[in-house]
Interface confidence: medium
């Protein structure tokens, strides 16, 4: 632990002014793991002036950073790039004359305290005023800056010409598109200072290319994937003061696919489980042994979970018997196409024939053979359900 500091497994605090620290505290290689440090508290360190790009990067678990009553003058732009867990920053009573929003734009801060710094009135700190205005009044800080006349004025009163939030305007066609097709989105940005523009496509799967000048840009998405239905695409305008974005949701229409169809399982009811993807929502039709299955309150389709364009459900059967055994075919259909899958369902054997013959005579299987029980071998298959007495049935269900 550096001189003038104390360290624990999760905290570093440096408050002793003598001899004090001149650089941001770093841990010795064989001491505490820096990833476990969640709080750094620094006070009364007049000779600590700079936070360099690599000073804080080792503390990836850092949540609270406090530097108060110290000599902090400069924070490198990428100083907090690796500290995505940072929630509270307190730089009260330091020597900061400027601070860029680029330090913090990637962080989800719940608190940034900057009281008592000799900020210079310029467009560079206008973002702090904007941030203050966006917050509710109890959280406002009394922030001041020095104007050209070296006069302290409240940040709340700061007026700087040609220094405002940018705007983004997304000109999108109808963003309902068929799978495999392509679309182009256009965006224009405006503001002073002139903003940069970029596209935020999140985790878009489809291939995309953008062409961007300073104030105008286009995004071409080709061979659109059904996996991108429901995703948001944003055009972002950003300058010193802040950012603005305009967003659209992509809707992809595509033919249904039955991604899952399994043999029945028994819970409260019997269920033939399925998963179908498709947009618009596919119509579902069941066939039993090749004929249309007319649903009723005893046999009906239930959708249990809808995940945008994916539907998880069951063909639910109440108390099926051997008469319901057979081939079940699911057909999913919308205007873009159809898919079908089939499974064989075995709910019950023949009463009186598959239930181990005479129930009062359980050893039927061995009579006249003289074979030991373990000679019978593994006569059920693939399932960890109730052991079956019918070794012809692979599902391992009790009949």
């Amino acid at each position: 632990c550096p001189t003038s500091c104390k360290c624990s497994a999760s905290r570093i605090w440096c408050s002793d002014p003598s001899p004090g620290i001149v650089a941001f505290p770093r841990l010795e290689p064989n001491s505490v793991d820096p990833e476990n440090i969640t709080e750094i508290f620094i006070a009364n360190q007049k000779r600590l002036e700079i936070i360099n790009e690599d000073d804080v990067e080792a503390y990836v678990g850092l949540r609270n950073l406090t530097i108060v009553d110290s000599g902090l003058k400069f924070v490198a732009h990428k100083a907090f790039l690796k500290n995505s867990n940072l929630q509270h920053i307190n730089f009260t009573r330091n020597k900061l004359t400027s601070l860029s929003r680029k330090h913090f734009r990637h962080l989800d801060l719940s608190e940034l305290i900057l009281v008592g710094n000799p900020f210079t009135c310029s467009c560079d700190i206008m973002w702090i005023k904007t941030l203050q205005e966006a917050k509710s009044s109890p959280d406002t800080q009394d922030l001041y800056c020095l104007n050209e006349s070296s006069k302290n004025i409240p940040l709340a009163n700061l007026q700087i010409p040609n220094c405002g939030l940018p705007s983004a305007n997304l000109a999108a066609p109808n963003l309902t598109v068929e799978e495999g097709k392509s679309i182009t989105l256009s965006c224009s940005v405006a503001g002073d200072p002139v903003p940069n523009m970029y596209w935020d496509v999140g985790n878009l799967v489809s291939k995309h290319m953008n062409e961007t000048s300073h104030t105008q840009g286009s995004l071409r998405i080709t061979n659109i994937s059904s996996d991108d239905s429901g995703k948001q695409i944003s055009c972002v305008a950003e300058n010193l003061v802040g950012e603005d974005q305009d967003s659209v949701n992509l809707t992809v229409h595509f033919a249904p696919t039955i991604t899952f169809l399994e043999s029945p399982t028994s819970d409260h009811h019997w269920c033939i489980p399925f998963t179908v993807k498709g947009n618009p929502k596919p119509a579902l039709q069941w066939f039993y042994n090749g004929a249309i299955l007319n649903e009723s309150k005893y046999i009906c389709t239930k959708i249990h979970v809808t995940n945008h364009t994916e539907y998880h459900g069951c063909l639910q059967l109440d108390n099926p018997t051997h008469m319901n055994n057979g081939d079940y075919t699911l057909i999913a259909k919308n205007e873009y196409g159809k898919d079908e899958k089939q499974i064989s369902a075995h709910f019950m054997g023949w009463p009186g024939i598959d239930d181990g013959a005479n129930p009062n005579y359980p050893d039927v299987i061995y009579e006249d053979y003289g074979t030991a029980a373990n000679d019978i071998g593994d006569t059920t298959n693939r399932s960890n359900e109730i052991p079956s007495t019918d070794v012809t049935d692979k599902t391992g269900r009790e009949h």
Epitope: G326, I353, V364, D368, G377, T379, V391, T392
Partner: antibody, heavy 117, light 108 residues
Framework: QVQLQQSGGGVVQPGRSLRLSCAAS????????MHWVRQAPGKGLEWVAV????????YYADSVKGRFTISRDNSRNTLDLQMNSLRAEDTAVYYC??????????WGQGTMVTVSS | LSELTQDPAVSVALGQTVRITCQGD??????ASWYQQKPGQAPVLVIY???NRPSGIPDRFSGSDSGKTASLTITGAQAEDEADYYC???????????FGGGTKLTVL
């Protein structure tokens, strides 16, 4: 030893009836489901019907449903197949077989049924 | 009604291994039983369930199962193994018994 002895085959005209019998010995007849299986000349095996150990349940192949009736008498250790409205395509060797919950493990010697005018 | 499909005829050299297959949708849900039938005789159960032999059946007979295909394997075929072999299972509804069309095995 375990045995199934069949009787009742013969030649019969189309539309007429015939009754086949199967006598069981050497095992506890009332503990087993019983089947009838047939084999047309030069052809493969075809399942015909099954009856549960106590006679309470019967199942038939579509080709004989409504015309054939399977029955049993556990007191006499006998299995019967009553065949009505016989057709030329019913011509076959008919076997009775003992049903276990894994297959047919004991078979009768077979009896020939010929349906011809 | 679903079907069980077998090759009509298969031959094997004496002492060699032969595999007889049976295919059908119902075999996804049910195991096959296998029967041997010699001319003029009643069928004899040789394999049932996953791979089980009734007593008295030589251990050169074995069964296996893969999805919609069931197989009977005779390892080291003997002259007395020459016969018709039938697979038997349920149809997909489970409400009927099915036999395959039979495979005539010739031992050369």
């Amino acid at each position: 030893q375990v045995q199934l002895q069949q009787s009742g085959g013969g030649v019969v005209q189309p539309g007429r009836s015939l009754r086949l019998s199967c006598a069981a010995s050497g095992f506890t007849f009332s503990n087993y489901a019983m089947h009838w299986v047939r084999q047309a000349p030069g052809k493969g095996l075809e399942w015909v019907a099954v009856i549960s150990y106590d006679g309470s349940n019967e199942y038939y192949a579509d080709s004989v449903k409504g015309r054939f009736t399977i029955s049993r008498d556990n007191s006499r250790n006998t299995l019967d197949l009553q065949m009505n409205s016989l057709r030329a395509e019913d011509t076959a060797v008919y076997y009775c077989a003992r049903g276990t919950n894994y297959g047919m493990d004991v078979w009768g010697q077979g009896t020939m049924v010929t349906v011809s005018s | 009604l679903s079907e069980l499909t077998q090759d009509p005829a298969v031959s094997v050299a004496l002492g060699q291994t032969v595999r007889i297959t049976c295919q059908g949708d119902s075999l996804r849900s049910y195991y096959a039983s296998w029967y041997q039938q010699k001319p003029g005789q009643a069928p004899v159960l040789v394999i049932y369930g996953k791979n089980n032999r009734p007593s008295g059946i030589p251990d050169r007979f074995s069964g296996s199962d893969s999805g919609k295909t069931a197989s009977l394997t005779i390892t080291g075929a003997q002259a007395e193994d020459e016969a018709d072999y039938y697979c038997q299972s349920r149809d997909t509804t489970g409400n009927y018994l099915l036999f395959g069309g039979g495979t005539k095995l010739t031992v050369l």
